[in-house]
């Protein structure tokens, strides 16, 4: 007789956690190597048993120590003989147990007295599965067929909910869902003015607890004194928890405070934070920049700049910048309206300009003055002669703001 895998199709039902032995009877072959297949995939299982019934008749077992839902499926065995594969009739394995949850109630945050829903679903086998709802330790609904939706009209405090699934094998309890009450957010903290200019201020803050409802926006209120008239109120979507305040008055004292809102309403304001905008840089350039040749070098003079208004504040030192054709350049600060320039190369053209500074920065540069090398060579006259040979060049002259120290000898500026 040829190779035969004996047995009719079988439906086998076992309880979850129980051991299972699926058997496969092989006739017509000595000591077969039996392979087990589940749902089309070879079962890699070293836990196989064999019983020799006779020399040409063997029974193989697939041993499952503890059946689980994932073991359920269609099994068969197969044996190779002479390059051909014989396949047995299938065994349909069903694993029954207490219900298994596919959907469990989730934690929620809701406004007081607002309606909400919770969902629960469990499956067998065995079916049917029924659902019972619990609110804390009180049964509140059911039994109802799975899946089940619990409609709650509202709660006034944090409340626990769970569901229980029943079938012929017993019951299973879901996770406990906590329904939290939403509340107004807490006040922001760490309110900081991160960047200041004469007319703008950048503000950043940390949000307080959101009251279990998404923060939707924050309001930045600005006054010229704590509790004074509101100058500005900016509503910003969040995150990020930052805001740029624009169009502020220079050199002015302000205070700001921040609050944030969720769907239920706004938080309290954070404490007032004082700040002061910077003043304006000087608006005017020094006028009438001119030069006088001396034996020791070159004297540069210009007219004093008078502040145009209180926002400029007191005007401080002057900044003098010069550059030569050979690339040598320098910047220096001088207190008055006169500087003695020495150490420059008279064989090269010289460009000089000056600005006045205050606490904010330097104002506009004066018109550049150019000293030509041939002018130096040809100039005669007594020391401190007020004859000027410096001629303003057009505004297309180089504007150097940065410091650059070259290997050339640096000229000296003396008051």
């Amino acid at each position: 007789a040829g190779l035969k895998l004996m047995g009719a199709p079988v439906k086998l039902t076992v309880s979850q956690g129980q051991p299972v032995k699926l058997n496969c009877s092989v006739e017509g072959m000595e000591e077969p190597d039996i392979q087990w297949v589940k749902d089309g995939a070879v079962v890699q299982n070293l836990d196989q048993l064999y019983i020799p019934v006779s020399e040409q008749h063997w029974i193989g077992f697939l041993s499952l120590k503890s059946a689980e839902r994932s073991d359920a499926g269609r099994y068969w065995c197969q044996v190779e003989d002479g390059g051909e594969t014989e396949i047995s009739q299938p065994v349909w394995l069903t694993v029954e147990g207490v219900p298994f949850f596919t959907v469990e109630p989730k934690d929620l945050a809701v406004p007081p007295n607002a309606p909400f829903q919770l969902s629960c679903e469990a499956v067998g086998p065995p079916e049917p599965v029924t659902i019972v709802w619990w609110r804390g330790t009180t049964k509140i609904g059911g039994p109802a067929p799975s899946p089940s939706v619990l409609n709650v009209t509202g709660v006034t405090q944090s409340t626990m909910f769970s569901c229980e699934a029943h079938n012929l094998k017993g019951l299973a309890s879901s996770r406990t869902a906590t329904v939290h009450l939403q509340a107004l957010p807490a006040a922001p903290f760490n309110v900081t003015v991160t960047k200041l200019s004469s007319s703008n201020a950048s503000v950043a803050w940390m949000p307080g607890a959101d009251g279990r409802a998404l923060l939707q926006s924050c309001t930045v209120q600005v006054t010229q004194a704590p509790g004074g008239w509101e100058v500005l109120a900016v509503v910003v979507p969040v995150p990020p928890f930052t805001c740029l305040l624009r169009d502020l008055v220079p050199a002015t004292n302000y205070s700001l405070r921040v609050r944030c809102a969720n769907a239920l309403g706004p938080s309290p304001y954070a404490d007032w934070v004082p700040f002061q905008t910077k003043g304006l840089a000087p608006a005017s350039a020094p006028q009438n920049l001119h030069a006088i040749r001396t034996d020791s070098g070159l004297i540069l003079e210009w007219e004093e700049v008078i502040p145009e208004g209180p926002l400029e504040g007191p005007l401080g030192p002057y900044k003098l910048s010069w550059v030569q054709d050979n690339g040598t350049q320098d910047e220096l600060t001088v207190e008055g309206t006169r500087a003695n320039l020495t150490g420059w190369d008279p064989q090269k053209d010289l460009i000089v300009r000056v600005c006045v500074s205050n606490a904010v920065g330097c104002g506009p540069w004066s018109q550049p003055l150019v000293v030509s090398s041939h002018d130096h060579a040809g100039q005669q006259g007594p020391p401190h002669s007020r004859t000027s040979w410096l001629v303003p060049r057009g505004s297309s002259a180089h504007h150097h703001h940065h410091h650059h120290h070259s290997a050339w000898s640096h000229p000296q500026f003396e008051k």
Epitope: Q44, L46, D47, Y50, I51
Partner: antibody, heavy 125, light 108 residues
Framework: EVQLVQSGADVKKPGASLTISCQAS????????ISWVRQKPGKGLEWMGR????????YYGPSFQGHVTISADRSTATAYLQWRSLEASDTAMYYC??????????????????WGPGTLVTVSS | SYELTQPPSVSVSPGQTARITCSGD??????AYWYQQKSGQAPVLVIY???KRASGIPERFSGSSSGTMATLTISGAQVEDEADYYC???????????FGGGTKLTVL
């Protein structure tokens, strides 16, 4: 009486190939499986792999997959463990085991009742 | 790769009960086997399929399994029980075997 006779101790250099053997007697060779177990000096047991009764199915432990080959010759009732390129870390005692024992529930492959005396393999330069 | 974890050593006085544990994630689904190895000898099967005693093994040896833990119990340990004990099981996928690291039982 079931007997598993293993080949003698061997000393090899790293990179060398080696095959050790395990000859079974006292039972029908194709009624049972053969497993190989390694034990490094002063260390624990390590399951290397198993070959089915007909040699059609082999299983290997993850540490040994691709490094060793298990085979069997039914005509001589002999199982083999082969290395293509030995490493110093292969120095160990190698046991062949008859996998499968008769119990009231049937023949259990993982019932390791009969062990060979072991083959000591030393790999040193 | 799959691992079985055993305590490195257990000490008892003669006549006391020795318990050796073995933990592995697949033990709820896969059987545990216990092997005894005395110094210089090949291992000997003591317990198979969690709790069944192998032939020729004294009744003081018993096995149990619960969840991810298998336990070998020697009730009234004797000096001759001093040995290394290894648990053995199969990987979660069922495609390779694994020994635990071994437990040295000392009977003082």
């Amino acid at each position: 009486e079931v007997q598993l006779v293993q080949s003698g101790a061997d000393v090899k250099k790293p990179g060398a190939s080696l095959t050790i053997s395990c000859q079974a007697s006292g039972y029908t060779f194709t009624d049972y499986w053969i497993s190989w177990v390694r034990q490094k000096p002063g260390k624990g047991l390590e399951w290397m792999g198993r070959i089915s009764r007909h040699g059609s199915q082999t299983y290997y432990g993850p540490s040994f997959q691709g490094h060793v080959t298990i085979s069997a010759d039914r005509s001589t009732a002999t199982a083999y463990l082969q290395w293509r390129s030995l490493e110093a870390s292969d120095t160990a005692m190698y046991y062949c085991v008859r996998a499968g024992g008769q119990t009231s529930g049937g023949t259990i492959p993982e019932y390791y009742q009969h062990w060979g005396p072991g083959t000591l393999v030393t790999v040193s330069s | 790769s799959y691992e079985l974890t055993q305590p490195p050593s257990v000490s008892v006085s003669p006549g006391q009960t020795a318990r050796i544990t073995c933990s592995g994630d697949a033990l709820p689904k896969k059987y545990a086997y216990w092997y005894q190895q005395k110094s210089g000898q090949a291992p000997v099967l003591v317990i198979y399929e969690d709790h069944k005693r192998a032939s020729g093994i004294p009744e003081r040896f018993s096995g149990s399994s619960s969840g991810t833990m298998a336990t070998l119990t020697i009730s009234g340990a004797q000096v001759e029980d001093e040995a290394d004990y290894y648990c053995y099981s199969i990987s979660p996928a069922g495609n390779y075997g694994v020994f635990g690291g071994g437990t040295k039982l000392t009977v003082l």
